[in-house]
């Protein structure tokens, strides 16, 4: 569904301003911060969401080992530059003219430089590893049940096609969800794994981006699945370029 016509809100993004000023008086929603029109029938891009967040008031064994090229978002929040489609621009700079290159999920993939830094292309993050630790339960979850419910969650809540959920690993209390999506696999209209992972991350933190929906309440055969910590690793189609100084720090 598009923006809800009756009360003109955006079901998939509460960080919007909506008004019935679209064609034929239809409800149209614009992201805070950028003012860009968003499609409320799908997830909003992470770049627009980060920009909106920065503009908002501040109060408002079988397990996979991440590869040596995996990135973790250690830099935290920044006010990104987004292209007209809402994607991250390959080069990001702050107010003090410090610049760096980012991948398609907006995570820095080079050392920081000055305005002369070149970022030739936006490198795609094609593999995301979401590493969760759940709170203690009476017993371990059944792996097959867990797989079924997490797939359902990504399919139903984030509209991510099941083929992009590559695997769900479980070794109590650690759950790992692998999302994979190459450039060639992503068709028009497909939700991006980076956007799905970001919505999931915010849901897990109790900061749902959905309008009016309750927070994430995930249960497996009636047993609540409560997450106590999350780590997300990002793997790019082209390995990141950091100096040895950073790697040995």
């Amino acid at each position: 569904h598009t923006a809800a016509q009756d009360n003109c809100t955006c079901p998939t993004n509460k960080m919007t301003v909506c008004s019935p000023d679209g064609p034929g008086g239809r409800c149209q929603c614009r992201a805070l911060g950028s003012g860009m029109a968003v499609d409320c029938s799908t997830l909003t891009s992470k770049c627009l969401l980060l920009k909106a967040r920065m503009s908002a008031p501040k109060n408002a064994r079988t397990l996979v080992r991440p590869s040596e090229h995996a990135l973790v978002d250690n830099d935290g929040l920044y006010d990104p530059d987004c292209d007209p489609e809402g994607r991250f621009k390959a080069r990001q700079c702050n107010q003090t003219s410090v610049c760096w290159c980012v991948n398609s999920v907006g995570v820095r993939r080079t050392d920081k430089g000055d305005l002369s830094l070149r970022c030739d292309e936006l490198v795609r993050t094609h593999h995301i590893l979401i590493d969760l630790r759940h709170r203690p339960t009476a017993g371990a979850f059944n792996h097959s049940d867990l797989d079924a419910e997490l797939r359902r969650l990504f399919r139903e809540r984030y509209r991510l096609h099941p083929k992009f959920v590559a695997a769900v690993h479980y070794e109590q209390p650690t759950i790992q969800i692998e999302l994979r999506q190459n450039t060639s696999q992503k068709a028009a209209g497909d939700v991006d794994i980076g956007d799905a992972a970001y919505y999931f991350e915010r849901d897990i933190k109790g900061e749902s981006l959905f309008q009016g929906r309750g927070g994430l309440d995930l249960r497996v055969r009636g047993e609540p699945l409560q997450v106590e910590r999350t780590l997300i690793y990002y793997l790019d189609e082209i390995p990141p370029k950091f100096s040895m100084k950073r790697l040995t720090a």
Partner: antibody, heavy 117, light 111 residues
């Protein structure tokens, strides 16, 4: 033992709204699982209509989405189906069923709804 | 939508026969640890009854003469030795993608 029981009118006029209720006993619908409606036209196969989850989230079959609403009343441990603008093609046996982890382990006995003037 | 195709559409067999019904999905319904394919039995005037879930798991209370196997797109339901109460219509169902979809059914009749 979990039991599901459908109830509602057996005859609905074309263009009207079909309303059915499923009463669940032996399990609280807000404690877990997904609570579904499935239908079967006479002599034909099964068609999934949609569900409401333990937390109140909905998912509908896109082929019926514009006409379907599934809601719940947790105080009565019931969930309901509304199907608007019905035609003769909506004549079917309507089942409610529990979806455990994406398969249906408990079913109601079904109720036949005929759409006719 | 994922299309589920069962074969044969109908089948005549005798008590004691071994019978196999096939279900083919238009795309894979398997994950790394799951096969989202389930089998149901339906008798006239009754609700479907779950027989096998996730391709090969026998539902509690279902006789061991029923078995299922397969992965990806191709699945089978086998009844090792038909009993009189087994004459019914059988449906497969996928739950890898929404909307959930069922096969058209296989009617098992007495020869």
């Amino acid at each position: 033992q979990v039991q599901l029981q459908e109830s509602g009118p057996g005859l609905v006029k074309p263009s009207q709204t079909l309303k059915l209720t499923c009463t669940v006993s032996g399990y609280s619908i807000s404690s877990g699982y997904y609570w579904n409606w499935i239908r079967q036209p006479p002599g034909k196969g099964l068609e999934w209509i949609g569900y409401i989850s333990y937390s109140g989230r909905n998912l509908y079959n896109p082929s019926l989405k514009s006409r379907v609403t599934i809601s719940r009343d947790t105080s009565k441990n019931q969930f309901s189906l509304k199907l608007s603008s019905v035609t003769a093609a909506d004549t079917a046996v309507y089942y409610c069923a529990r979806d455990t982890t994406a398969y249906f382990d408990y079913w109601g006995q079904g109720t036949l709804v005929t759409v006719s003037s | 939508d994922i299309q589920m195709t069962q074969s044969p559409s109908s089948l005549s067999a005798s008590v004691g026969d071994r019978v196999t019904i096939t279900c083919r999905a238009s795309e894979s319904v398997s994950s790394s640890v799951n096969r989202f394919l389930h089998w149901y039995q339906q008798k006239p005037g009754k609700a479907p009854k779950l027989l096998i879930y996730r391709a090969s798991n026998l539902e509690s209370g279902v006789p061991s003469r029923f078995s299922g196997k397969g992965s990806g797109t191709d699945f089978t339901l086998t009844i090792s030795s038909l009993q009189p109460e087994d004459f019914a219509t059988y449906y497969c169902q996928q739950s890898n993608e929404d909307p959930y979809t069922f096969g058209q059914g296989t009617k098992l009749e007495i020869k």
